[in-house]
Interface confidence: low
């Protein structure tokens, strides 16, 4: 009779993580008598996956009833596959012996490859805010995918970016892989509403890529422009001076009025108006009682925005003649009155 052969008909099997792998194995003869064992890997360090004779293998089920005397199908199923299960599996026939069974013949092996989905990409921006015209870096990371082939793209508001560098680790063979990419983005004043998107495509995603996003509102700082104007006279001896703070982001802003260099009042931006581009405008105003003054007054509007060094704008208030109409009445009625008598 022809000598027993162990046939593993599948050179390779590709399974999605979490799925079940079927590893097929048939013998060509019932002789010699003895059990089958399945191993991952070959040589002395091989790992026992299933032993027909003894042991507990909760993730493994046999395809056929191995207790039947005429059974020659030793295929197994391994449940809940993870990338760590990847490797070459050998079906090995043992000959019954005393005291131990003796390895008789091995199948050619079946390579189990595991397809694992990448994790959702995580995009992170710089630790500190930057102003328009500056270049900032964003990183994107995704982990745990297999096989190694993966595609990563960057977009800003739907437009693909080209200035980025990507690495897939490790370089050699591994059960799963990670991708890390850094993109450079130039900020503009209009970027408060902008988004940076990292898009990852992988064979396991079936054409539906994963995306990670970062809002540039977390990254950008748009410094304000200031304008101090003298408004029309409200009463014979009162002048209304306004400080218009325009086009700033984020909202965190503190304004200080100085009269001839001395601090008059400090306030925090509260009732701001939002522009279409996401930046803010705010206005503060003073009612100055000019009759209490003999000399000209230098009024300074000083603004500290988002913890940055203060910027200021001054206005010289002439008290020798009656105040003339200067500037315009823009939005003055919409803000609270900050009345101040100067003595």
């Amino acid at each position: 009779e022809e000598e027993l052969q162990v046939i593993q008909p599948d050179k390779s099997v590709l399974v999605a993580a979490g799925e079940t792998a079927t590893l097929r194995c048939t013998a060509t003869s019932l002789i010699p008598v003895g059990p089958i064992q399945w191993f991952r890997g070959a040589g002395p360090g091989r790992e026992l996956i299933y032993n027909q004779k003894e042991g507990h293998f909760p993730r493994v089920t046999t395809v056929s009833d191995l207790t039947k005397r005429n059974n020659m199908d030793f295929s197994i199923r391994i449940g809940n596959i993870t990338p760590a299960d990847a490797g070459t599996y050998y079906c090995v026939k043992f000959r019954k012996g005393s005291p131990d069974d003796v390895e008789f013949k091995s199948g050619a092996g079946t390579e189990l490859s595991v397809r694992a989905k990448p994790s959702a990409p995580v995009v992170s921006g710089p630790a500190a805010r930057a102003t328009p015209q500056h270049t900032v870096s964003f990183t994107c990371e995704s982990h745990g995918f297999s096989p190694r082939d993966i595609t990563l793209k960057w977009f800003k508001n739907g437009n693909e970016l080209s200035d980025f560098q990507t690495n897939v680790d490790p370089v050699g063979e591994s059960v799963s892989y990670s991708i890390h990419s850094t993109a450079k983005v130039v900020l503009t004043r209009e970027d408060v509403h902008s988004q940076v998107i990292c898009e990852v495509a992988h064979v396991t995603l079936q054409g539906d890529p994963l995306r990670g996003t970062a809002n540039l509102s977390e990254t950008i700082r748009v410094p304000p422009t200031l304008e101090v104007t003298q408004q029309p006279v409200r009463a014979e001896n009162q002048v209304n001076v306004t400080c218009q703070v325009r086009k700033f982001y984020p909202q965190r802003l503190q304004l200080t009025w100085l009269e001839n260099g001395n601090v008059s009042r400090t306030e925090t931006a509260s009732t701001v108006t939002e522009n279409k581009d996401g930046t803010y405008n705010w206005m503060s105003w003073l009612l100055v009682n000019v009759s209490a003054h003999r000399d000209d007054v230098k009024l300074t509007c000083q603004v500290e925005h988002d913890g940055q060094p203060a910027v200021s704008k001054s206005h010289d208030l002439k008290v020798s003649a009656h105040p003339k109409e200067q500037g315009s009445n823009t939005a003055a009625e919409n803000t609270g009155s900050n009345e101040r008598n100067i003595y």
Epitope: V15, E19, N71
Partner: antibody, heavy 123, light 107 residues
Framework: QIQLVQSGPELKKPGETVKISCKAS????????MSWVKQAPGKGLKWMVW????????TYADDFKGRFAFSLETSASTSYLQINNLKNEDTATYFC????????????????WGQGTLVTVSA | DIVMTQSQKFMSTTIGDRVSITCEAS??????VAWYQQKPGQSPKLLIY???NRYTGVPDRFTGSGSGTDFTLTISNMQSEDLANYFC?????????FGSGTKLEVK
């Protein structure tokens, strides 16, 4: 296209034997595993067996060992289910269902189903 | 054997509703779960495989989710043609087992 066509309804008496068939077409029969599924009237689905069409070896659910015999006629691309010593509780619709992939890649959900064969066991 | 429990035998719905059908496995099955729809007198029809993959031609109002032991089939915008029986199935280990089914009825 892929089709599984089952034999017609059967009316049997308790103690008799029934053999129903499932003929496959539109693919290579021995490349895909085949299962049989039972559905009693108004009840759920019970998986009975998976047959390795390559080796002919069946894998049974415990409830279907003994009186149930499953066989193949590969030249005719046909799978058979035979129930011996019929009992009233065997009254059900029996479906054959094919694996979705070449079974080296292992999943076992069912895309392709036969239309079902109603077996009625009544004295 | 792995027991697949569909705790709700019947669910009353309204057309346009969002419906979630749950299935619990008695032990970890990874993502080796499929969902089927069956109408009276018909064979089951595959909707979802690998827990969350929609089968070709299945409307995108059907979505599957879950892994491990807890699985959900969601119909986002219930249609009259969705009134049927729904079964989950595990194929992680032999014997393959089905849930007992959840029948969707109109209120």
């Amino acid at each position: 296209q892929i089709q599984l066509v089952q034999s017609g309804p059967e009316l049997k008496k308790p103690g008799e034997t029934v053999k129903i068939s499932c003929k496959a077409s539109g693919y290579t029969f021995t490349t895909y595993g085949m299962s049989w599924v039972k559905q009693a009237p108004g009840k759920g689905l019970k998986w009975m067996v998976w047959i390795n069409t390559y080796s002919g070896v069946p894998t049974y659910a415990d409830d279907f060992k003994g009186r149930f015999a499953f066989s193949l006629e590969t030249s005719a691309s046909t799978s058979y289910l035979q129930i011996n010593n019929l009992k009233n509780e065997d009254t059900a619709t029996y479906f054959c269902a094919r694996d979705p992939h070449y079974y080296g890649s292992s999943p076992a959900w069912f895309v392709y189903w036969g239309q079902g064969t109603l077996v009625t066991v009544s004295a | 054997d792995i027991v697949m429990t569909q705790s709700q035998k019947f669910m009353s719905t309204t057309i346009g509703d969002r419906v979630s059908i749950t299935c619990e496995a008695s032990q970890i099955v990874g993502i080796a779960v499929a969902w089927y729809q069956q109408k009276p007198g018909q064979s089951p029809k595959l909707l979802i495989y690998s827990a969350s993959n929609r089968y070709t031609g299945v409307p995108d109002r059907f979505t599957g989710s879950g892994s491990g032991t807890d699985f959900t089939l969601t119909i986002s915008n219930m249609q009259s043609e969705d009134l049927a029986n729904y079964f989950c199935q595990q194929y992680s280990a032999y014997p393959f087992t089905f849930g007992s089914g959840t029948k969707l009825e109109v209120k």
